[in-house]
């Protein structure tokens, strides 16, 4: 039961996390104009990974996409890449984890296969979460650096021709969404990896509790399972008695570590 719960919860948490990563990546408010001592502004600037926007107090909002690739800062490109990699890995992880869920039966898929798939998806979620956290953190660091640079130099000139008030930018909502989403995906991935340990058939367990008789060796497991004779390659562990009603969690082809606890 605990394995399914852990796996299911890991899947749900990761799903929410990846949805959050996608949302954060698409959001326009990665950086927002710092209002410092002026809470009401006539022109409010905010920027995302893909476009920058201006909201006027008239209610008019104008967004312009970054229609150049080469002209963009390398850091922004790196953040974009990290977020996309995070989304792609997360999406693949979700796809894999759906088939790995214990509550979903697909043909005669062995628990060992499900355990491997659970571990794979867990690792994918962990990497996905780390990519998102890294991406958001790189962007945040870029903002902090630029913030102090623009504070030191509130006015900037462009070749002496155009004078513009330096707009200072601070953390936008997307950064917090990204951090939380990345964290959730990471937690979900860890939970999937923990669930995998509960699903995986590990023969070392039998060795740890085996008793060697003079004629042949038999490994006993508490809980109504008897391992095959000897330590060769067991193809099936036969259930010799049914100890009453069991939940779906307990109906397993292979014993798991969870059963030893």
């Amino acid at each position: 039961m605990a394995v399914t719960a852990c796996q299911g919860l890991g899947f749900v948490v990761s799903l929410i996390g990846i949805a959050g990563i996608i949302a954060a990546t698409c959001m326009d408010q990665w950086s927002t104009q710092d209002l410092y001592n002026n809470p009401v502004t006539a022109v409010f600037n905010y920027q995302g990974l893909w476009r920058s926007c201006v909201r006027e107090s008239s209610g008019f909002t104008e967004c312009r996409g970054y229609f150049t690739l080469l002209g963009l800062p390398a850091m922004l490109q790196a953040v974009r890449a990290l977020m996309i990699v995070g989304i792609v890995l997360g999406a693949i992880g979700l796809l894999v984890s759906i088939f790995a869920l214990k509550c979903i039966r697909i043909g005669s898929m062995e628990d060992s296969a499900k355990a491997n798939m659970t571990l794979t998806s867990g690792i994918m979620f962990i990497v996905s979460g780390l990519c998102a956290i890294a991406g958001v953190s790189v962007f945040a660091n870029m903002l902090v650096t630029n913030f102090w640079m623009s504070t030191a130099n509130m006015y900037t000139g462009m070749g002496g021709m155009v004078q513009t008030v330096q707009t200072r930018y601070t953390f936008g909502a997307a950064l917090f969404v990204g951090w939380v989403a990345g964290g959730l995906t990471l937690i979900g991935g860890v939970m999937m990896c923990i669930a995998c340990r509960g699903l995986a058939p590990e023969e070392t367990n039998y060795k740890a509790v085996s008793y060697h008789a003079s004629g042949h060796s038999v490994a006993y497991k508490p809980g109504g399972f008897k391992a095959s004779t000897g330590f060769g390659s067991n193809t099936k562990n036969k259930k010799i008695y049914d100890g009453g009603a069991r939940t779906e969690d307990e109906v397993q082809s292979y014993p798991s570590k969870h059963d030893y606890v």
């Epitope: 009401v40 502004t41 006539a42 022109v43 600037n45 008239s58 209610g59 312009r64 004078q163």
Partner: antibody
Framework: EVQLVESGGGLVQPGGSLRLSCAVS?????MNWVRQAPGKGLEWVAW????????TYADDFKGRFTISRDDSKNTLYLQMNSLRAEDTAVYYC???????????WGQGTLVTVSS | DIQMTQSPSSLSASVGDRVTITCKSS????????????LTWYQQKPGKAPKLLIY???TLVSGVPSRFSGSGSGTDYTLTISSLQPEDFATYYC?????????FGQGTKVEIK
């Protein structure tokens, strides 16, 4: 088509109060009050977001003037307290448009502060 | 607060003349977010409410004759009437639309010579 009609102007004694109204029809996201003293230039008074109620004032009017709106009546107000002789002006309500420009203006209402 | 200074305060011109009014702001009105200058021009005739002519320094309002044009960036802006018409004799105001409080220039009165 946006239409703005001001009312509530008149003669008031120094130190007195007056509430100006601006009946609004058509789409107005945010509104302003602008005044013009006789023979003088335009002076911006206050701004309000008609949806959120967010507002801001020119420094000279903070504390004395209050901009507000009534959603049910689709009306904009300017409550003026502690009026002084220098507040004598024609008061206009105006809609804020693209580029934070004032595209639609009311006909104006004259406020005279005199003893 | 941003101060707006218009020049000249008044000018006399004849029909068909090219008229230029300048407006200087104490701070830049150019927004780095969209590279637009938040400066607006109005025309006001005696006893009437002001009429919007130009916003974003150079965007002409629909219905306004093309003889009106706006230019400038940063702190220096210009309103040009290419060929003055009888109905253009009025007072012209520039306005800071970049930050609260919105501020107006003192006005330029265009009179018949």
């Amino acid at each position: 088509e946006v239409q703005l009609v001001e009312s509530g102007g008149g003669l008031v004694q120094p130190g007195g109060s007056l509430r100006l109204s601006c009946a609004v029809s058509g789409y107005t996201f945010s509104m302003n009050w602008v005044r013009q003293a006789p023979g003088k230039g335009l002076e911006w008074v206050a701004w309000i977001n008609m949806y959120t109620g967010e507002k801001t004032y020119a420094d000279d009017f903070k504390g004395r003037f209050t901009i507000s709106r009534d959603d049910s009546k689709n009306t904009l107000y300017l409550q003026m307290n502690s009026l002084r002789a220098e507040d004598t002006a024609v008061y206009y309500c105006a809609r804020l448009y693209n580029g934070n420009s004032l595209d639609y203006w009311g006909q104006g209402t004259l406020v005279t502060v005199s003893s | 607060d941003i101060q707006m200074t218009q020049s000249p305060s008044s000018l006399s011109a004849s029909v068909g003349d090219r008229v230029t009014i300048t407006c200087k702001s104490s701070q830049s009105l150019l927004n780095s977010g969209n590279w637009k200058s938040y400066l607006t021009w109005y025309q006001q005739k005696p006893g009437k409410a002001p009429k919007l002519l130009i916003y974003w320094a150079s965007t002409l309002v629909s219905g306004v004759p093309s003889r009106f044009s706006g230019s400038g960036s940063g702190t220096d802006y210009t309103l040009t009437i290419s060929s003055l018409q009888p109905e253009d004799f009025a007072t012209y105001y520039c306005q800071n639309a970049y930050s609260f409080p919105f501020t107006f220039g003192q006005g330029t009165k265009v009179e018949i010579k």
